[in-house]
Structures are given as structure tokens and as C-alpha cells.
Amino acid sequence: AWELTILHTNDVHSRLEQTSEDSSKCVNASRCMGGVARLFTKVQQIRRAEPNVLLLDAGDQYQGTIWFTVYKGAEVAHFMNALRYDAMALGNHEFDNGVEGLIEPLLKEAKFPILSANIKAKGPLASQISGLYLPYKVLPVGDEVVGIVGYTSKETPFLSNPGTNLVFEDEITALQPEVDKLKTLNVNKIIALGHSGFEMDKLIAQKVRGVDVVVGGHSNTFLYTGNPPSKEVPAGKYPFIVTSDDGRKVPVVQAYAFGKYLGYLKIEFDERGNVISSHGNPILLNSSIPEDPSIKADINKWRIKLDNYSTQELGKTIVYLDGSSQSCRFRECNMGNLICDAMINNNLRHTDEMFWNHVSMCILNGGGIRSPIDERNNGTITWENLAAVLPFGGTFDLVQLKGSTLKKAFEHSVHRYGQSTGEFLQVGGIHVVYDLSRKPGDRVVKLDVLCTKCRVPSYDPLKMDEVYKVILPNFLANGGDGFQMIKDELLRHDSGDQDINVVSTYISKMKVIYPAVEGRIKFSTGSH
């Protein structure tokens, strides 16, 4: 028998520095977790103790904090090189700055293979990107070889900016021939490493003949055997065992997100490359694990530029940006309109001639808007200003909901109106009318939504049984502020870009902004 240790991360999302327990900015260092310096300490400890170790990343290193805003992927290449990752799969967020924003900062700079079998380049890009990412890579590990085959969510064109010269194929269809090729090369130990979410990971384990282990990402899935060490609730045991169609037991793993855990999986193979046993657990990277001093020093060196960036002007406002709780928790506020407009703008993807865009709607809890911005400071808007407005380090995500769920959400928005509570919704691509004289749960008297399958966008009444795409904060997607109906009834959820980054990019693009209060949210009394 031959034993392999797989160390894995996924959905790190720019958390290079240690974070608080909820993966936001570290405040009390003695209680902080994760970060590449701490990760390196643990990885090195395991590398010294065990003979056959692979360090793998399942995608979405890009996007999530000011580190990515400033360094645009150079930080990912640098620190992944420093940690000596063995391979990485491309995630959807790796395309957030377009193909160019992937090629130069990461693909060219990485000293480890970057993989995806189901992304095919065409046109002029094919020769340009040739060899910079691979469908698979055979890695020598001790006296053996291990094949790693990559995959990426085929939804990426809707979630990011891969352009028109990359085709995202069905994962299973694309993986099978690559695995077959590895078999012909006498590689009998094969790991599928990818970024399509836990449901697809399980399907790959079930359907792709010859895959021995699946290491996934995208769905931020936390798996654990035994008593979990922090706040995350396990979605299943680690590893999650799938019985393949050809009768094999295939371990599937994922390691939550944000670099909080290091996935740790031990696999025992027989001489024919069959998995005999698999066991392990994610390792919580808490403060009991010291940060590696040399990596920490490097982090501090790179950190300097981030502080400089925070105070640079992104753009100007010529109007007061009303982000006060007195406004945003009671009525339409222009800060809410600005943020929602930025959220929609960030999700413009012309992927189908029938649609002017795939999504037109935004909802945003008023309680998530934490500060106004005064235009009398020469109109200047900085990252620092936006960090006061959106201090929680969340993301603006894409969900699919039925109209009936949206109706419930808008009823919840005003179910206890007048108490300055955070659930009051700010909107974009939606016209809502409330009648507060009616009883809670029956106060939405008009709800019109902007069409997407149209050449001239216009507002149509919400249809209860129709499925709509909506951009919203991850806080709402996870049922925050009492929006349990969103969490329970959403049909699809894809994590998006860092909230501040979305708004800062929009302001930089617009240069001068003047959002108005324009009748998106109205109140009435009496008949309709």
C-alpha cells in the first residue's frame, strides 16, 4: 500500500492576512485565524512529518479583499509560489478581470500547474493561452505519480468575465477523455480538482470512470467528522463518500472557504491504484498555529501599498450620498440606489441575443448601509469612505428565486416597519409600493420588475411562478436579517465579488456620480 496526503484549500478569496473567526478583518490577533503565513506553518509541519504530500487549491483565490483590488492577482501568484502549491484549478472568479487579468498576473507568474479540462480556448486566444493552463498534470510524488485533472463551473460566463473566446464545456463530458488519457499513460491514481460546487463534485465522483478522489470548491462546503472546531456546521462527513456507477467508493472533499481551514485527507492506495482507505478532517488554522515569520514579513511588506491605496480618490460625487439609517431603513435612499446600480453594472453579461442582460434586479438590506458620504469634501470618494459604508467585507451574490419568494421577501421588508430595523430593502430594477395601513404580511400592493428578455427594458408585474435572477448581499442569501425565505427557497446561489470592490469599480468607471431618489420604493394608503 502507498499513502498520499492531500492538503487542500478552496475559495480563499484574497484572505492573505489572518482574519477574524467570521473571515472578516482581523481585530483581536489572539483570536484570529487563517492567512498564508499560518497556512505555511501547518503545511511545512505536515511536509516534514509525512512522505507523500500534495498541496492543492480548488480555485477562487481571486476576489474578496483590498489585496485583490490593488494587486489584481499578483499577490495570488507570489504567495502561492512561496507556499509551493503543487496545483490549482481555475475558479470562476479567476476571470473577474477578464482573460488578460488571469494570464499576466497568475498564469504567467505561477510556478505550479493551473488546470481546467472543460475550458477550451478558440480564435486568437487559443495560441496565446496555449500551455498556460492545462487539462491535467502528472505530478511525481515520492516514487509514484499522481494525475491531477482540473474542472471549472460551466456557469462562469454568467458569474464572471471570461470573454467570448473561452468555451466552458460540461464538466463530466470534458473530464472523462482526459482521465482516459491519463490511464493510457499508466497513471492509476487520479485526483479531480475543481470548482463547480459540491453537487457537481459528487456527480463527478459518481460518473467519471477512473477518478479516485474529488477535491472541490465553489459552494464553500464544510465537511467534518466528529465535533466541529468552530462555527461552521458540517454538510456531511469528511471525506464524503460517493459510490461510483462502477461500484467504487470515491472520497469527495472541500474545505469551507477563506483559508480558515486546511483540508487534510489521507488516502491509501493499493498497488493497482485503487483507494483502500481514506480519512482526515479540515484543520482549523487558529491562533494556536503560529504565523511563519518569513511569510509574515513578506505580507507586511506587501501590506504597505494597501494603506496608500485606501486614501486615493476613486471618483467624485456631486450630491450627498445619503447612507443614514434614518433614510435607508425607512425609505428609498440614494446610497441604496447607487449600490444597487453598481451591483447590476458589475453583472452585465451579454451572453444571449434574446436578453439585454441575464439579471436586472437587486435587493439590499438597508441595515447593511452603515454610513453616508458627504459631497462637501471636494466630492472625493475613497476606498476608506466606502469601507465605512460597507464595513462587513461581504459579497454581492447571484441567486435564482421564484417570484413568490421575492414577494415574501418584500413583505418581510416592512413587516415591522417604523422600528429602524435593518431588513427594509433598497432596490434596483424593481418598483415596489407598500400600504402600511394593511396588516403585516399583506403590505406589498404593487411589485413590478424590470424585464431581461427584452430589447427595451420596462417594468412588468412580478409573476409568482416565474424564476428570477437577483443580485443581493451574501448576508441576505444566507438568510440574514430574518430573510429565511431566501435561504430556504433559493434555487441557485453563486458567490460574487467583494461588496466594496463592486461599488469602487462602478464609481471609478462613472468618474462623477449623482444618484437620485427616483420612486423605486413608494408608499400608499387605500385602494389599488
Partner: antibody, heavy 123, light 108 residues
Framework: EVQLVESGGGLVQPGRSLRLSCAAS????????MHWVRQAPGKGLEWVSG????????GYADSVKGRFTISRDNAKNSLYLQMNSLRAEDTAFYYC????????????????WGQGTLVTVSS | DIQMTQSPSTLSASVGDRVTITCRAS??????LAWYQQKPGKAPKLLIY???SLESGVPSRFSGSGSGTEFTLTISSLQPDDFATYYC??????????FGQGTRLEIK
């Protein structure tokens, strides 16, 4: 306006040392890798050495490895080339050049060049 | 190290001509290639990077193409100011930078 001004060139005997300096202005110096490129009279261009923006990646041409040392002082917006054990074949114009993209660990292309300083190694 | 070979070494042409200079790499460099123009007594000037991207301020009569090992610099209609020496340069990942030997473009 980006400006790169080299200094420190001159006539030096074989085996001796010389230190070249390059003063940079008009751009955020500490965001970019910097390089020295040389050109012997009437000959082509030869890359001599490069240093990444954070000084972690330092590279040399085989012809100067072990003899030349590149360094930078980001606080002073300055690039240096310490040249020891000079040989006749090191005679050339030495150009200071700025790398194209910011924050890279490896080297790219040179979008701005200084006017060069002449180093003559002769007895 | 990656060797870069330019051809021809010298090229004679007239104003208005379309001229092409070729650069060949000893191994694949994807499209990590730049072209420079140098006039006597002056520092080189960047024309093209990433094989085909035109540096800002460079006239559109200059264009670059190719990938892998074969690259070309084309001047669509030669102007008096274009008579100079041209160099290609590869910057493949973590390889030492190397230049071609140069192509001197002279008046016919």
C-alpha cells in the same frame, strides 16, 4: 513624465569596480521591476540584470553572474548596479530600464529607458 | 537560455514600402515577445509588447503578429522616420531575458 537618468559610468581598469546609479522620477518607482541593459559599441542589446519591485526576484545574465550586483532603494527612487572584477568585454553603454506591468515577480518588457551611461574597461 | 534569431540582419527599403522583420525563438515563448526601435545614439523605444499589442503613442503602421516560436513585425507603409535598427525580445516566464541580434532597416 517618466524619467530615468543613469550616472557613474567612466573609464576603469580591468579587475576594478564601478557603481552605476539610476535616478527615477515621474512614476511610482516601487511598483515596478527595474533592469540594466547594456550595448557594446556597434553591437546589439544585452540584458544584464533585473530586480522585481519587492526585490524578491533578482536575476543576472550568465556573463555577469557573481561579479555584478543589482539593488534598489525605493525610498530614494534609485536603482544601482555594483560592477566588480570588470573585464574589457564589459565595455558598453549601460541603460537603466523600467519594466512594463506593475507588481510582477518575473520580468517583462521595457517601456521606458534612460539615455545610458558609457562604461569603458581598458588598461 | 532561449535564443532569438532575427532575419534579415539588414533590410533595404523605400518610403511607402511594406516591410516585414521576422524573429524566431529557439523554443515556444507563447506570445511573450516585444519589439523595439533604436536610432543611432539613442535609447531603444518600445513599439510592441505581448507579440501584437501596440504601445501607446506608437503609429498604427507598426503591427506585430505570431505566437509560439515565429513572430513578425510589420511596417505597413514605411516613413522616413522609420529607418532604424529593430530588436525583438522574449520574456518567457522565469527565463533570462534575451534579445534578437537586431535588424538594420536602411534606405534603398
Amino acid at each position: 513624465e517618466v524619467q530615468l537618468v543613469e550616472s557613474g559610468g567612466g573609464l576603469v581598469q580591468p579587475g576594478r569596480s564601478l557603481r552605476l546609479s539610476c535616478a527615477a522620477s515621474g512614476f511610482s518607482f516601487d511598483d515596478y521591476a527595474m533592469h540594466w541593459v547594456r550595448q557594446a559599441p556597434g553591437k546589439g542589446l544585452e540584458w544584464v540584470s533585473g530586480i522585481s519591485w519587492h526585490s524578491d526576484n533578482i536575476g543576472y545574465a550568465d556573463s555577469v553572474k557573481g561579479r555584478f550586483t543589482i539593488s534598489r532603494d525605493n525610498a530614494k527612487n534609485s536603482l544601482y548596479l555594483q560592477m566588480n572584477s570588470l573585464r574589457a568585454e564589459d565595455t558598453a553603454f549601460y541603460y537603466c530600464a523600467k519594466d512594463g506591468p506593475r507588481y510582477r515577480g518575473s520580468y517583462y518588457y521595457f517601456d521606458y529607458w534612460g539615455q545610458g551611461t558609457l562604461v569603458t574597461v581598458s588598461s | 537560455d532561449i535564443q532569438m534569431t532575427q532575419s534579415p540582419s539588414t533590410l533595404s527599403a523605400s518610403v511607402g514600402d511594406r516591410v516585414t522583420i521576422t524573429c524566431r525563438a529557439s523554443q515556444s515563448i507563447s506570445n511573450w515577445l516585444a519589439w523595439y526601435q533604436q536610432k543611432p545614439g539613442k535609447a531603444p523605444k518600445l513599439l510592441i509588447y505581448k507579440a501584437s499589442s501596440l504601445e501607446s503613442g506608437v503609429p498604427s503602421r507598426f503591427s506585430g503578429s505570431g505566437s509560439g516560436t515565429e513572430f513578425t513585425l510589420t511596417i505597413s507603409s514605411l516613413q522616413p522616420d522609420d529607418f532604424a535598427t529593430y530588436y525583438c525580445q522574449q520574456y518567457n516566464s522565469y527565463s533570462p531575458i534575451t534579445f534578437g541580434q537586431g535588424t538594420r532597416l536602411e534606405i534603398k
